[in-house]
């Protein structure tokens, strides 16, 4: 119905009021719900109303505003401190202790975060984004510096429909269209072989507790698993001779670690060169990511931080020990 210049939507009635004609919904069930567009942000709950905008948001603190879009900082909250002496004693021993796995305790001194003590160091959001990994979109954390809110703003729940098949046929130089989607890792770029690469700046340097021969044997699964977490594609970097940059890793060289090892090995000298795992250099190829998403890593810094964030959550499927983002061409060093 309409009255004058006011056009009312389906199911609404026009009423003349002292301030002019207004649309009104006599029965919210018969009208288009204002909640249909999910207007309430940051976990606010939406309630249908009879008058425009036909919804009201009940906001969860610390948010306010008609759509819960405003962040209100709590009155000068003192920064959290890591109070436990226990955590101070156990930090940086290479073991993740959940009681110390907090931002205040630097994620157990890096033990829970692949040695990265603050993956959110570049995140300038007013929110503590590490506390907002909660399976719902928090736009204030949805930036590359804040690790894209753990990809919770773009249907993180999508899973690869034919996961077993796609895993078996990942990066096998044959395009499987059923696997050529973001959630299936774009078939390891098998369907984009004719497209130019789109490399992110830098290199991911990862230490993983698998010997080089085992890692290379399992490379497709390894790259798919990490690519799934980063929502892009990875490849092992090649050196100037064209060789894959996967090197034996002999473990920590710190004095503390060496001291511990001396106490636990019968013949330390003889076993000094025992291979503990691999150091692998990875590149990010965004050629498919940029076509399907605006959440791609332009450099490897935030990608490394996101892997550290997954370590904190305990969602890594490989025994990663450390991750570093290198900007320059790396030397082949231990």
């Amino acid at each position: 119905s309409s009255c004058g210049q006011v056009k009312c939507r389906k199911g609404e009635q026009c009423v003349h009021t002292a301030s002019g004609p207004r649309c009104f919904c006599p029965s919210p069930r018969d009208c288009e719900s204002g909640c249909a567009s999910s207007p309430c942000q940051h976990g606010g709950s939406c309630h249908p109303q009879r008058q425009p905008p036909y919804y009201s948001c009940q906001c969860a603190p610390p948010f306010s505003g008609s759509r819960c879009e405003l962040y209100t900082a709590p009155p000068s909250t003192p920064p959290a401190t890591c109070l436990s002496q226990y955590c101070a004693d156990k930090a940086r021993d290479g073991v993740c202790d959940e009681a110390c796995n907090s931002h205040a305790c630097q994620w157990d001194g890096g033990d829970c975060s692949l040695t990265m003590e603050n993956p959110w160091a570049n995140c300038s959001s007013p929110l503590p984004c590490w506390d907002y990994i909660n399976n719902q979109c928090d736009e204030l954390c949805n930036t590359v510096e804040c690790l894209f809110d753990n990809f919770e703003c773009q249907g993180n729940s999508k899973t690869c429909k034919y996961d077993k098949y796609c895993a078996d046929h990942f990066k096998d130089n044959h395009c499987d269209q059923g696997c050529n989607s973001e959630e299936c890792g774009w078939d390891g770029l098998d369907c984009a072989a004719d497209q130019p690469e789109n490399l992110a700046e830098g290199t991911l340097v990862i230490v993983v507790l698998m010997p080089p021969e085992q890692l290379l044997q399992d490379a497709r699964s390894f790259l798919r698993a990490l690519g799934t977490l980063l929502h892009t594609n990875l490849r092992i970097k090649r050196d100037s001779q064209g060789e894959l940059m996967v090197y034996p890793y002999y473990g920590e060289k710190s004095a503390a670690m060496k001291k511990q090892r001396m106490t636990r090995r019968s013949l330390p000298g003889e076993q000094e060169q025992e291979v503990a795992g691999s150091k692998v250099f990875l590149e990010i190829d965004n050629r498919q990511c940029v076509q399907d998403s605006d959440h791609c890593f332009k450099n490897t810094d935030a990608a490394a931080a996101l892997l550290a964030s997954h370590a904190i959550q305990g969602t890594l499927s490989y025994p990663l020990v450390s991750v570093v983002s290198e900007s320059l061409t790396p030397e082949r060093t231990q």
Partner: antibody
């Protein structure tokens, strides 16, 4: 198949020493933490000690701190529990158990050995 | 140290019964709780981890629930092979601690 096999248990006098071994097979020994858990006759389970073979980091229950030492030989895929100054209350079946989360002591123990009996008696 | 208190310490039940065992932590442990089953002369076996996730090969009649300080293990329909002792264990922080056990016996 992932397997843990303990050995080294036996009868020992109070104040004596004993070394238990836990041979691991079927998985990457370096990658997973290992605990020793004991059970006194007719009693419940008591955690004793933990080691992460990769870093050598160790954790102990207060009841054994200073008397027991956990270690690991990554070349032999074996964890050890060196028990000194043994007391009657240390009498128990000792189990080694693998932690399910790579470098996390904060993970459940998903694989257990069959246990080895330690009896401390005069 | 975090204390774990299990109840009851023992219970008698019949095949087909629904059995519930509770476990309480002296402080919040989030979901860092496991349940183990132990039969006489055998090693413990992991049933539930993360308070509610079933370990590989564990029948669906076993379920876990709870978070924070209060947890429950439920056996929906008791089978003959389920008569055993059940332990809860927190792995939130060291020292790792177990409940005192609940013995499930045949009525």
């Amino acid at each position: 198949e992932v397997q843990l096999v303990e050995s080294g248990g036996g009868l020992v006098q109070p104040g004596g020493s004993l070394r238990l071994s836990c041979a691991a097979s079927g998985y990457s020994f370096t990658s997973y933490g290992m605990s020793w858990v004991r059970q006194a006759p007719g009693k419940g389970l008591e955690w004793v000690s933990y080691i992460y073979p990769y870093s050598g980091a160790t954790y102990y229950a207060d009841s054994v701190k200073g008397r027991f030492t956990i270690s690991a030989d990554t070349s032999k895929n074996t964890a050890y529990l060196q028990m000194n100054s043994l007391r009657a209350e240390d009498t128990a079946v000792y189990y080694c158990a693998r932690h399910s989360g790579y470098y996390r002591i904060s993970s459940a123990m998903d694989v257990w050995g069959q246990g080895t009996l330690v009896t401390v008696s005069a | 140290d975090i204390q774990m208190t299990q109840s009851p310490s023992s219970l008698s039940a019949s095949v087909g019964d629904r059995v519930t065992i509770t476990c309480r932590a002296s402080q919040s442990i989030s979901s860092y709780l496991a349940w183990y089953q132990q039969k006489p002369g055998k090693a413990p076996k992991l049933l539930i981890y993360g308070a509610s996730s079933r370990a590989s090969g564990v029948p669906s009649r076993f379920s876990g629930s709870g978070s924070g300080t209060d947890f429950t293990l439920t056996i929906s329909s008791l089978q003959p092979e389920d008569f055993a002792t059940y332990y809860c264990q927190q792995y939130y922080s060291s020292p790792l601690t177990f409940g005192q056990g609940t013995k499930v016996e045949i009525k």
